[in-house]
């Protein structure tokens, strides 16, 4: 139902959902700090622009007794309960920041008349694609899927001369929220990835994965998984791996590969790591000082959500336009705004764009090296290392099917 918004007469409120079930197990205090830091920046930007207005955030906490699992998979109703709470208190702001769980975002979008913008740090799943008033500030599954299809089809690079059309996907159900939805998108039979591949099988057991590594009858040489190097080691250990196996490790929110003193362990030599180009370390920020890389991105998305609202508020106020209109609700897309540590580009559907980086382990230096980059905004791959020092034969990625010649 319609809720009156605290969003006029020079006073603009942001409703921040502080949910027990969250995409990442982040203390809510850290998210509050990120939001408050964002508010300070927004106030400064508006003041600099000569806009004498008040911007505040209201933190809406859910009932910890009912929703206390902390797990996104039980989050479906939590968002709706919070919206009811907001509705009853007549405390809706100009914009809603949160939720981060795909289930709760999808349900909230479905069950409410959204005449206000919704900004999410998460909501990675395909079910949250193409939502007219939803903006997502962490790379959603659709972006990953488009990279993979693009890379699979590529056959004109010195280090990749075969198109691929097959893959195994390892998905055991214990993944983090981002990985869960990334792999879910690859698994879905109706997804773009599945549509473009001729063969795809999901491996759900550790043993299935381990057996494939040396199985002469395997149907694909390529295995996609999601997590960090430690996760891979737990699964693979020091087992022998057939020489034409390629493991694609999706680890988007992890900057550790770019650190100067990092050496790639031996078990990473058959692995290509897909990550985001490194961000600023944000070490000077109160909210990020003790955070792991992934949690830093999560907190940063909350902060950038505040900055995005400030950006749009500034534009609308400067143009003398009303904030409580469908035009405002639909405006949070197809733009670049000044984020906390650099510009942030949103695509036509309000999803954040990024520069993805595919890394390999150099057999010479045992360092992670950039093989190529991929711009999600233009769906284009840019080769970087034209003569990589791969573990694979002839320093080329193998065919995805053993024994099949050039196509």
């Amino acid at each position: 139902s319609q809720v009156s918004q605290n969003c006029h007469n020079g006073s603009y409120e942001i409703s921040v959902l502080m949910m027990g079930n969250s995409a990442f197990a982040e203390p809510l205090k850290n998210l509050e700090d990120a939001v408050n830091e964002g508010l300070e920046i927004v106030r400064g930007r508006l003041q600099n622009a000569g806009l004498n207005v008040t911007v505040n955030a209201t933190f809406m906490y859910s009932d910890g007794l009912i929703h206390n699992s902390g797990d996104c998979r039980s989050s479906t109703c939590e968002g709706l309960d919070l919206l009811r709470k907001i509705s009853n208190a007549q405390r809706m702001g100009c914009v809603l920041i949160g939720p981060s769980c795909t289930y709760s975002t999808f349900q909230m979008y479905l069950d409410t008349e959204l005449s206000y913008p919704m900004i999410s740090a998460g909501s990675f799943g395909l079910s949250c694609d193409y939502k007219e008033t939803l903006t997502r500030l962490m790379s959603p599954a659709r972006k990953l899927m488009y990279f993979l299809v693009n890379f699979w089809k590529t056959n004109d690079l010195p280090f990749k001369t075969y198109s691929w059309s097959t893959s195994y996907v390892y998905k055991n159900g214990t993944e983090t929220e981002d990985c869960f939805w990334y792999l879910n998108a690859l698994e879905a039979s109706v997804s773009y990835f599945s549509h473009e591949l001729g063969f795809k099988v999901v491996l759900r057991q550790d043993k299935e994965f381990q057996d494939i590594l040396m199985d002469h009858n395997r149907k694909s040489n390529v295995i996609i998984m999601c997590g960090g190097p430690e996760f891979l080691y737990k699964l693979k250990g020091d087992r022998a791996v057939a020489e034409d196996i390629v493991i694609i490790l999706v680890d988007l929110f992890n900057d550790q590969y770019f650190e100067d003193n990092v050496t790639a362990p031996d078990y990473m030599k058959n692995v290509l790591v897909l990550t985001l180009s490194p961000g600023n370390s944000l070490l000077n920020s109160s909210f990020s000082r003790n955070l792991s890389p992934t949690k830093r991105d999560f907190a940063l998305a909350y902060l950038n959500g505040i900055l995005l609202f400030g950006h749009m508020l500034k534009i609308f106020l400067e143009n003398g336009e009303n904030i409580t209109t469908p035009k405002f609700a639909h405006a949070f897309r197809n733009l670049t705004f000044e984020g906390y540590d650099g510009p942030v580009t949103l695509d036509d559907w309000g999803d954040v764009d990024s520069t993805m980086v595919l890394l390999y382990t150099s057999v010479d230096t045992k360092k992670y090296k950039v093989l190529l980059t991929y711009d999600t905004h233009v769906n284009k791959t840019y080769p970087v290392d034209m003569s990589p020092t791969f573990t694979w034969k002839n320093s080329k990625l193998p065919n995805d099917i053993t024994g099949r010649g050039p196509q």
Partner: antibody, heavy 127, light 109 residues
């Protein structure tokens, strides 16, 4: 704290080339654009070109196209600017500068400002 | 190429007074404009980016405003350390070319 440290002053003859280095320390190097900006004595700032190390390719201002080469060596976190066919009007202080990063924006076309600068390298071209 | 024109070329101001510097672009650069301060013998220092956002560690007396083609840098109360040359820079079209304005020298009256 990220710092850019440039190589020392150079004196060159007209027609020769100069190569100035810019070493980054204290932070990730790969995904930031490193630009080169020059300033002739008593004059303003002039952008020459830039490179994003993880992309590998450089972009140049039209004025310097064909005469300047910008490269980056990720293994040493160092960017280089080589200017050839030097003439007396190339006498200037050459600065390297790093932008604010591009984790969440569209690749090479990311609009950005320079938040960290090197100390400058004086290049004198004289016969 | 986008041309940035700064005015005035020189601004004489007394300490404690307000200084207003202008930068005009030959075509719209949206909010992709930065301001830098440069003192003799030093590298430029980023003051403002995104037309109005203060860079880390920059005092609140510096503020930027404007978008499109008209931009202003305001120093609300000049301190002795603020006497320097100020440059605007557009970064709307990287690639192919970033451009700087000709600079405004703020000197003691």
């Amino acid at each position: 704290e990220v710092q850019l440290v440039q190589s020392g002053a150079e004196v060159k003859k007209p027609g020769s080339s100069v190569k100035v280095s810019c070493k980054a320390s204290g932070g990730t190097f790969s995904s930031y654009a490193i630009s080169w900006v020059r300033q002739a004595p008593g004059q303003g700032l002039e952008w020459m070109g830039g490179i994003i190390p993880i992309f590998g390719t450089a972009n140049y201002a039209q004025k310097f196209q064909g005469r300047v080469t910008i490269t980056a060596d990720e293994s040493t976190s160092t960017a280089y600017m080589e200017l050839s066919s030097l003439r007396s009007e190339d006498t200037a202080v050459y600065y390297c500068a790093r932008d604010r990063g591009r984790r969440y924006c569209s690749g090479g076309s990311c609009p950005n400002a320079f938040d960290i600068w090197g100390q400058g390298t004086m290049v004198t071209v004289s016969s | 190429e986008i041309v940035l024109t700064q005015s005035p070329a020189t601004l004489s101001v007394s300490p404690g007074e307000r200084a207003t510097l202008s930068c005009r672009a030959s075509q719209s650069v949206s909010s992709n404009l930065a301001w830098y301060q440069q003192k003799p013998g030093q590298a430029p220092r980023l003051l403002i980016y995104g037309a109005s956002t203060r860079a880390t560690g920059i005092p609140a007396r510096f503020s930027g405003s404007g978008s499109g083609t008209e931009f202003t840098l305001t120093i609300s109360s000049l301190q002795s350390e603020d006497f320097a040359v100020y440059y605007c820079q557009q970064y709307n079209n990287w690639p192919p070319a970033l451009t700087f304005g000709g600079g405004t020298k703020v000197e003691i009256k």
